[in-house]
C-alpha cells in the first residue's frame, strides 16, 4: 500500500513510510483540538488488494468551549449554532439595554483546551442624564435625575415679560433613546413676530390678525387683472421672517392677438401652490398669463395651469 489516508481530525502516529506491506497496521490519534470518543476504530490495515481498509475520523470530535447562557436582558447567539473552537459567540442586548464588554467572543484553543477569548458581556439598562435646561422655558420631570429608555419629557415656554409671548421652536417632546442619548436637541423659547404682510393689488383671505407669531399662516389672492408671483400661503418662521417670502401681485399683460380669458379673480404663476377651494365668490379657475409676443415685455413661463380644485 502507498501512504495511508490523511484526515482533518486525526493524524498518523509515527512517521509515514513510502509504502506498507500487506497486513501492516497504522494507528491514528486525534489531532490537537479534537478528542476521541469510543468505540470507532482509529487504525487501518493494508489490505491484500493494496488498499487501506476503510477508516474515518468520525471518532474524533472537535473541542468545544463551555456553554454560555444569554446575558440577562440579552442573547448569546453561537455563530453556526456551535460551541466548537474556531467559531464565534455573538452577544446582543434587548431593546432598551446596551452591551458592556465584548460583542463577540471567540472559541480558541489554549494548549489542547478550547476556551473563550474573554469574559461574557453584560446588558445594562439604557439610562439618560436629565435633558438640557432651556432659556425662557422648562420641561416636565425636572426633579428626576435619571431617565430610563423611552422616558419622555415635554418642554413648554415661560410666560413672556412683554406683550409678545415666547414661542416654542422645535419639537416639544423628546425621549431617552439608544446609547443614552436624547432623541433630538431640546427646543428653544423665544419671541417670534413677523411683520404685517402687505400685498399690493391683492388681499389676505385667511389668517387675519393684528400680530403674527411663530407658525402664523396667511393666504392671499390677487385683485382682478393681477396674477400671483410667489406662493399664496406664507408662514411665519423661527427667524421672524415669512417663508416663503410675501408674494407680489403683478398685472396681467394684454395678449398679442387673442383676448385674454375672462378672469373671475386672480392669476398665479405657481403651478405647485393651490389656492383655497372656495372663496366668497365661489370657485376661482386660475390661469397663466397669456404669452406676449411684443418685444420688451417679460415672457412668463409657458403653458397653461390646470384649473385648481
Amino acid at each position: 500500500c502507498e501512504e495511508p489516508p490523511t484526515f482533518e481530525a486525526m493524524e498518523l502516529i509515527g512517521k509515514p513510510k513510502p509504502y506498507y506491506e500487506i497486513g501492516e497496521r497504522v494507528d491514528y490519534k486525534c489531532k490537537k483540538g479534537y478528542f476521541y470518543i469510543p468505540p470507532l476504530a482509529t487504525h487501518t490495515i493494508c489490505d491484500r488488494n493494496h488498499t487501506w481498509l476503510p477508516v474515518s475520523d468520525d471518532a474524533c470530535y472537535r473541542e468545544t468551549c463551555p456553554y454560555i447562557r444569554d446575558p440577562l436582558n440579552g442573547q448569546a447567539v453561537p455563530a453556526n449554532g456551535t460551541y466548537e473552537f474556531g467559531y464565534q459567540m455573538h452577544f446582543i442586548c434587548n431593546e432598551g439595554y446596551y452591551l458592556i464588554g465584548e460583542e463577540i467572543l471567540y472559541c480558541e484553543l489554549k494548549g489542547s483546551v478550547a476556551i473563550w477569548s474573554g469574559k461574557p458581556p453584560i446588558c445594562e439598562k439604557v439610562l439618560c442624564t436629565p435633558p438640557p435646561k432651556i432659556k425662557n422655558g422648562k420641561h416636565t420631570f425636572s426633579e428626576v435625575e435619571v431617565f430610563e429608555y423611552l422616558d419622555a419629557v415635554t418642554y413648554s415656554c415661560d410666560p413672556a415679560p412683554g406683550p409678545d409671548p415666547f414661542s416654542l421652536i422645535g419639537e416639544s417632546t423628546i425621549y431617552c433613546g439608544d446609547n443614552s442619548v436624547w432623541s433630538r436637541a431640546a427646543p428653544e423659547c423665544k419671541v417670534v413676530k413677523c411683520r404685517f404682510p402687505v400685498v399690493e393689488n391683492g388681499k389676505q383671505i385667511s389668517g387675519f390678525g393684528k400680530k403674527f407669531y411663530y407658525k402664523a399662516t396667511v393666504m392671499f389672492e390677487c385683485d382682478k387683472g393681477f396674477y400671483l408671483d410667489g406662493s399664496d400661503t406664507i408662514v411665519c418662521d423661527s427667524n421672524s421672517t415669512w417663508d416663503p417670502p410675501v408674494p407680489k401681485c403683478l398685472k396681467v399683460l394684454p395678449p398679442s392677438s387673442t383676448k385674454p380669458p375672462a378672469l373671475s379673480h386672480s392669476v398665479s404663476t405657481s403651478s405647485t401652490t393651490k389656492s383655497p377651494a372656495s372663496s366668497a365668490s365661489g370657485p376661482r379657475p386660475t390661469y397663466k398669463p397669456p404669452v406676449s409676443n411684443y418685444p420688451g415685455y417679460p415672457k412668463p413661463e409657458e403653458g397653461i395651469l390646470d384649473s385648481l380644485d
Epitope: 478528542f35 470518543i37 470530535y61 473541542e63 468545544t64 463551555p66 456553554y67 454560555i68 447562557r69 444569554d70 446575558p71 440577562l72 436582558n73 442573547q75 448569546a76 460551541y83 434587548n94 489542547s112 483546551v113 476556551i115 473563550w116 469574559k119 461574557p120
Partner: antibody, heavy 121, light 107 residues
Framework: EVQLVESGGGLVKPGGSLRLSCAAS????????MSWIRQAPGKGLEWVSY????????YYADSVKGRFTISRDNAKNSLYLQMNSLKAEDTAVYYC??????????????WGQGTLVTVSS | DIQLTQSPSSLSASVGDRVTITCRAS??????LSWYQQKPGKAPKLLIY???RLQNGVPSRFSGSGSDTDFTLTISSLQPEDFATYFC?????????FGQGTKLEIK
C-alpha cells in the same frame, strides 16, 4: 424564601399527554433560567429541558426532543412542560429546578419537591 | 454527550470518617462540575458548583476539587445527616449530564 412547587403529574396511558406546571415564588422568576429534571424510580437523575429567562433559548435532551415542550409565563411566575406521545420510559418523578446565576456553567440551586408521572397501560 | 462516571457506586463509612467520592468525565470539562446530595424521597440539594465553590448554607466539611476530567467530593468528618446519595453533574455543554450516583451508607 425561594419555593418551587410542581403539579400536573399522574397516571397516563402510553401515547397520552400531560402538562406539568411549576409555580415559583420568593425570587424574581424572570431573571432565572429554569429546567426540568427527572428521576425514574430507584434510578439516577436525567436532565430533560432548559429554558432561558426570556424564553428565547430552549434546549432538550435527545430522549424527549419532538415530544416535550418547555415554556414559561413570567407574568404568572410559572414554568410548564407539555409532554406528548408519552412512553413507559418517561415514568419518573419530574423536578422543576432553578439555574444558579453565574454567567458560565449551569448548576441547579433550588429544586421543587417533584411530581410523579406514571406511564402505564 | 459528556459521560460522567462516579466511583464507588456505594460505600459504607462511620460518623467522623473522612470520605472521598470521585467523578470522571469522558472529556475535559474544565471546572464545570457540580455536586448534589439527595436523601430518600427528597429533591437533590446543591453542595458544590464550579468544581470547588461551596454553595451558600452548605457546611464547610464538604469540599470539591479537580479540573479537566477528574473531580473529587470530600467530606472531612462525616455527620449522621450526611448519609445520602451523591451525584455529580457537568455544566460544560448541553445536554447537562449527571453521574450515576454514589450511595453513602452507615457502616
Amino acid at each position: 424564601e425561594v419555593q418551587l412547587v410542581e403539579s400536573g403529574g399522574g397516571l397516563v396511558k402510553p401515547g397520552g399527554s400531560l402538562r406539568l406546571s411549576c409555580a415559583a415564588s420568593g425570587f424574581t422568576f424572570s431573571d432565572y433560567y429554569m429546567s426540568w429534571i427527572r428521576q425514574a424510580p430507584g434510578k439516577g437523575l436525567e436532565w430533560v429541558s432548559y429554558i432561558s429567562s426570556s424564553g428565547s433559548s430552549i434546549y432538550y435532551a435527545d430522549s424527549v426532543k419532538g415530544r416535550f415542550t418547555i415554556s414559561r409565563d413570567n407574568a404568572k411566575n410559572s414554568l410548564y412542560l407539555q409532554m406528548n406521545s408519552l412512553k413507559a420510559e418517561d415514568t419518573a418523578v419530574y423536578y422543576c429546578a432553578r439555574d444558579i446565576t453565574d454567567v458560565v456553567g449551569v448548576s441547579f440551586d433550588y429544586w421543587g419537591q417533584g411530581t410523579l408521572v406514571t406511564v402505564s397501560s | 454527550d459528556i459521560q460522567l462516571t462516579q466511583s464507588p457506586s456505594s460505600l459504607s463509612a462511620s460518623v467522623g470518617d473522612r470520605v472521598t467520592i470521585t467523578c470522571r468525565a469522558s472529556r475535559s470539562i474544565s471546572t464545570y462540575l457540580s455536586w448534589y446530595q439527595q436523601k430518600p424521597g427528597k429533591a437533590p440539594k446543591l453542595l458544590i458548583y464550579d468544581a470547588s465553590r461551596l454553595q451558600n448554607g452548605v457546611p464547610s466539611r464538604f469540599s470539591g476539587s479537580g479540573s479537566d476530567t477528574d473531580f473529587t467530593l470530600t467530606i472531612s468528618s462525616l455527620q449522621p445527616e450526611d448519609f445520602a446519595t451523591y451525584f455529580c453533574q457537568q455544566s460544560y455543554n448541553p445536554p447537562w449530564t449527571f453521574g450515576q450516583g454514589t450511595k453513602l451508607e452507615i457502616k
